[in-house]
């Protein structure tokens, strides 16, 4: 059994999250993860989920009673999701820490927008991609 | 030329982001994207980048002078990044909108943690994954 299981059970007690009523009104993450089988789609979703958990853990960083549990879970998340790669984790953390209200950050983001967009679709690296006809607004 | 290019140039003017000084102190996104060649790694990073842009655009949703540009860019982002799949975009948006300070959301997140963790590593779907020996401390 992976170390995170015992520690996650400990967090369930702390957050009073073991009761059946917690599942009322559907799931947060599990239903969404069920929708996506392709690895690249799953990473898009998991990236948001992992950043949510890191934010949540950050909010409870001063609570000593759950520190060991949080540390163990973060360790296992880093092993599993970032494949134990510190650079990957560091780059991810940089992205999650940019402030959307910082004027310099805004200017930089807009300055880089064209190049970011050019790299967004998987086929961007290998040649001109047929523009999908599917209709999207907003 | 993709439609977003002209509209991104328009945003550059609006944000005063065309000047060379904007590039001082390195890039926000481009340097990070350069580090990651594997599609699944790129999706982890791009997921955070795209959510940043959507948040940024949301902050300027009442500014009529850039509405057309923002809409065009968002549409093109949806085509490129979400492959014109509304369900993918909707699931992504749900994840970005969860509030980390909402007590019910916190309880649900902790309730689902064990199952989320079990699915984090790519091999999780196809059988028991050898626990990486690389060293991480949470």
């Amino acid at each position: 059994q992976d170390p995170y299981v015992k520690e996650a059970e400990n967090l369930k007690k702390y957050f009073n999250a073991g009761h059946s009523d917690v599942a009322d009104n559907g799931t947060l993450f599990l239903g969404i993860l069920k929708n996506w089988k392709e690895e690249s789609d799953r990473k898009i979703m998991q990236s948001q989920i992992v950043s949510f958990y890191f934010k949540l853990f950050k909010n409870f960083k001063d609570d000593q009673s759950i520190q060991k549990s949080v540390e163990t879970i973060k360790e296992d998340m880093n092993v599993k999701f970032f494949n134990s790669n510190k650079k990957k984790r560091d780059d991810f953390e940089k992205l999650t820490n940019y402030s959307v209200t910082d004027l310099n950050v805004q200017r930089k983001a807009i300055h880089e927008l064209i190049q970011v967009m050019a790299e967004l679709s998987p086929a961007a690296k290998t040649g001109k991609r047929k523009r999908s006809q599917m209709l999207f607004r907003g | 030329q993709d439609p977003y290019v002209k509209e991104a140039e328009n945003l550059k003017k609006y944000f005063n982001a065309g000047h060379s000084d904007v590039a001082d102190n390195g890039t926000l996104f481009l340097g990070i994207l350069k580090n990651w060649k594997e599609e699944s790694d790129r999706k982890i990073m791009q997921s955070q980048i795209v959510s940043f842009y959507f948040k940024l655009f949301k902050n300027f949703k009442d500014d009529q002078s850039i509405q057309k540009s923002v809409e065009t860019i968002k549409e093109d982002m949806n085509v490129k990044f979400f492959n014109s799949n509304k369900k993918k975009r909707d699931d992504f948006e749900k994840l970005t909108n969860y509030s980390v300070t909402d007590l019910n959301v916190q309880r649900k997140a902790i309730h689902e943690l064990i199952q989320v963790m079990a699915e984090l590593s790519p091999a999780a779907k196809t059988g028991k994954r050898k626990r990486s020996q690389m060293l991480f401390r949470g």
């Epitope: 170390p3 540390e71 973060k74 360790e75 880093n78 092993v79 494949n83 134990s84 790669n85 510190k86 650079k87 990957k88 984790r89 560091d90 | 350069k34 580090n35 990651w36 060649k37 594997e38 790694d41 990486s132 020996q133 690389m134 060293l135 991480f136 401390r137 949470g138």
Partner: antibody, heavy 123, light 110 residues
Framework: EVQLLESGGGLVQPGGSLRLSCAAS????????MSWVRQAPGKGLEWVSA????????YYADSVKGRFTISRDNSKNTLYLQMNSLRAEDTAVYYC????????????????WGRGTMVTVSS | NFMLTQPHSVSESPGKTVTISCTRS????????VQWYQQRPGSSPTTVIS?????PSGVPDRFSGSVDSSSNSASLTISGLRTEDEADYYC?????????FGGGTKLTVL
Amino acid sequence: EVQLLESGGGLVQPGGSLRLSCAASGFTFSSYAMSWVRQAPGKGLEWVSAISGSGGSTYYADSVKGRFTISRDNSKNTLYLQMNSLRAEDTAVYYCAKDHSSGWYVISGMDVWGRGTMVTVSS
Amino acid sequence: NFMLTQPHSVSESPGKTVTISCTRSSGSIASNYVQWYQQRPGSSPTTVISEDNQRPSGVPDRFSGSVDSSSNSASLTISGLRTEDEADYYCQSNDSDNVVFGGGTKLTVL
């Protein structure tokens, strides 16, 4: 001042065993992953093994897998390397090294090295 | 497992600039941090660059590190060479379950 002091090296016959120790001081030992790196006479550096701050995760170079065991005692601020089934090609100076990042980070680099202890495997 | 390849030796005169390369055989050089270690004769290694381009305290700014994705290599550059820079230099990186050192480069200050 951060210090690492290795001990336990010596002359051993092929097939024999040795246990190396590394006494650490000057930093919060349990917060850092630690590694063993070796250097054969006149050769380059070769990573041998590493262990997480808690001791819960360990990993090894292919050349020593199944023969060497890394461990640590955080209450004694000491790192160990148990070496069994020693071979002539294990002859080297063995360095103990501290990871440069505290916390949960990967072993991505070492920032402090001990002075090393010599292990000679010969009949 | 990947390999890191360094030139066996380089030499340059005092005051000049020298660059030591470190090429990764497989996998992207940019996808894991690169470290550089200096080892003077008869001494233990010391870190001169960590995490691609970070200088630990006490390391002079004459030492700099960089990573180039296009050549899949990292470089250590030492400017204003001094006689005390004469040493072996090792690059090091890792993947998810392996730490790898380059073969080392002997720097001679003429």
